[in-house]
């Protein structure tokens, strides 16, 4: 095959698969590429776009057995092991400054196979109830990415605010006022990503009180302290990458 | 439409040697890894060794290495499986198979060269 | 070498049945989120055809009727309505680095 045959063929893409993954921050991750023998191989290539940064390549050429880096400065972004045994590339301790779109570009003599990862990290937002007037609740979800979502039970006259942060993470603000007196115990309900939380509080009718859910105050409870019950791990909770053929 | 055909049937005698050929066809020799499997009768398929004409890398089974030699020929677009100092539990149909990339499949195989090694 | 060991080695069904056979790789052939296994039908005289790749991957043109599952070391193909054409022997294969076949299944006519 002519120098002129495998340039041309370098720009074929014979198969692209895109996926978005919701990877929990502080975890480890591992990108793989297409499912092809390094036999077959003439270049393995990770391209990474994280934001506000120039793109960052990682190759690899199997017939000079060389690597080379463009524009990496992210130490914790690196090969899995040599590229030669195994082509993934790993994300050790992953931070918020890791979204972005990771591809491995497969370079064969007839073409090329990618496998794009949009990669989504998930912060679990610090949760917290308390109430600060008469018949009046706030729920708070801080820090979170992406925002978390509350809901309450029952449901009662509720405003709520979201509070942007630089680094990409939402504080949500739920206060609710319940009128009807027959109601003593509210739940706050926050679903994420990385799972869902509970907490429950009594409605003192004591005006200007400001008591929290999380302070184990007379009559407070927090579910996940009196009944050991964690974060439910939800659809983003996976440390590990389930692959889509 | 992607063809692999084979040579013809072989007889040969003991401590002789076969040479088997696999003429490509419907797509660019060079492009793919050609692998040589052989069955025996009512044996499970073996793996011979592979070569891939991009760059001539060969690779073999331990069983066979010494005695199997595989090469091609680019300009006719064929692969060749050399056996010698044959023996009778040689005697098997012999097959090449294009390696498809993803996944490292065969999907496209020769339609098999049966070698007969008897005295 | 990954040794894969199939069973049954051969059984008897009828059209219609629902066939299930097993192949157990001696270490795990599943690695980078992939499973390196597939599965191959072969009738007499001919070279085998492949069905299933990738453990589960349906190859293009082969029926629906077939399907593979596993992960590790553990892989099923399933033939969910066995049909007259369906008589054959069945290979799971192995090809990551080294390639390995099962010792293979026929399914005969009960």
């Known amino acids: 095959m002519d120098e002129k045959q495998i340039t041309q063929n370098y720009s074929k893409v014979l198969a692209e698969v895109n996926t978005s993954w919701p990877v929990k921050m502080a975890t480890n991750a591992v990108l793989c590429c297409p499912p092809i023998a390094l036999r077959n191989l003439i270049i393995i290539t990770w391209e990474i776009i994280l934001r506000g940064q120039p793109s960052c390549t990682k190759a690899y050429k199997k017939e000079t057995n060389e690597t080379k880096e463009t524009n990496c400065t992210d130490e914790r972004i690196t090969w899995v092991s040599r590229p030669d045994q195994n082509s993934d590339l790993q994300i050790r301790t992953v931070a918020i400054t890791h979204d972005g779109y990771y591809r491995c570009i497969m370079v064969t003599p007839d073409g090329n196979f990618h496998r794009g990862y949009h990669l989504q990290v998930l912060v679990t937002p610090e949760v917290t109830l308390f109430q600060n007037r008469n018949r009046t609740a706030v729920c708070k979800a801080v820090a979170g990415k992406p925002a978390a979502h509350i809901s309450w039970i029952p449901e009662g006259d509720c405003a709520t605010k979201q509070e942007y942060w630089s680094n990409g993470t939402v504080t949500v603000k739920s206060t609710c006022h319940w009128e009807v007196h027959n109601v003593s115990t509210v739940t706050c309900h926050v679903s994420h990503l990385t799972g869902n939380k509970s907490l429950y509080i009594e409605l003192l009718p004591v005006p200007g009180a400001k008591k929290s859910a999380k302070g184990g105050g007379s009559g407070l409870n927090d579910i996940f302290e009196a009944q050991k019950i964690e974060w439910h791990e939800g659809s983003g909770g996976h440390h590990h990458h389930h692959h889509h053929h | 439409e992607v063809q692999l055909v084979q040579s013809g049937a072989e007889v040969k005698k003991p401590g002789a040697s076969v040479k088997v050929s696999c003429k490509a066809s419907?797509?660019?020799?060079?492009?793919?890894?050609m692998f040589w499997v052989r069955q025996a009768p009512g044996q499970r398929l073996e793996w011979i060794g592979y070569i891939n004409p991009y760059n001539d890398d060969t690779k073999y089974n331990e069983k066979f290495k010494g005695r199997a030699t595989l090469t091609s020929d680019k300009s006719a677009s064929t692969a060749y499986m050399e056996l010698s100092s044959l023996r009778s539990e040689d005697t098997a149909v012999y097959y090449c198979a294009r390696e498809d990339y993803y996944g490292s499949r065969f999907v496209y195989w020769g339609q098999g060269t049966l070698v007969t090694v008897s005295s | 070498d990954i040794q894969l060991t199939q069973s049954p080695s051969s059984l008897s069904a009828s059209v219609g049945d629902r066939v299930t056979i097993t192949c157990r790789a001696s270490k795990s052939v599943s690695t980078s989120g992939y499973s390196y296994m597939h599965w191959y039908q072969q009738k007499p005289g001919k070279p085998p055809k492949l069905l299933i790749y990738?453990?589960?991957n349906l190859e293009s043109g082969v029926p629906s009727r077939f399907s593979g599952s596993g992960s590790g070391t553990d892989f099923t193909l399933t033939i969910s309505s066995l049909q007259p054409e369906d008589f054959a022997t069945y290979y799971c294969?192995?090809?990551?680095?080294?390639?390995?076949f099962g010792g293979g299944t026929k399914v005969e006519i009960k």
């Open positions: 990738l453990a589960s």
């Open positions: 294969q192995h090809n990551r680095e080294l390639l390995t």
């Open positions: 419907g797509y660019t020799f060079t492009s793919y890894v």
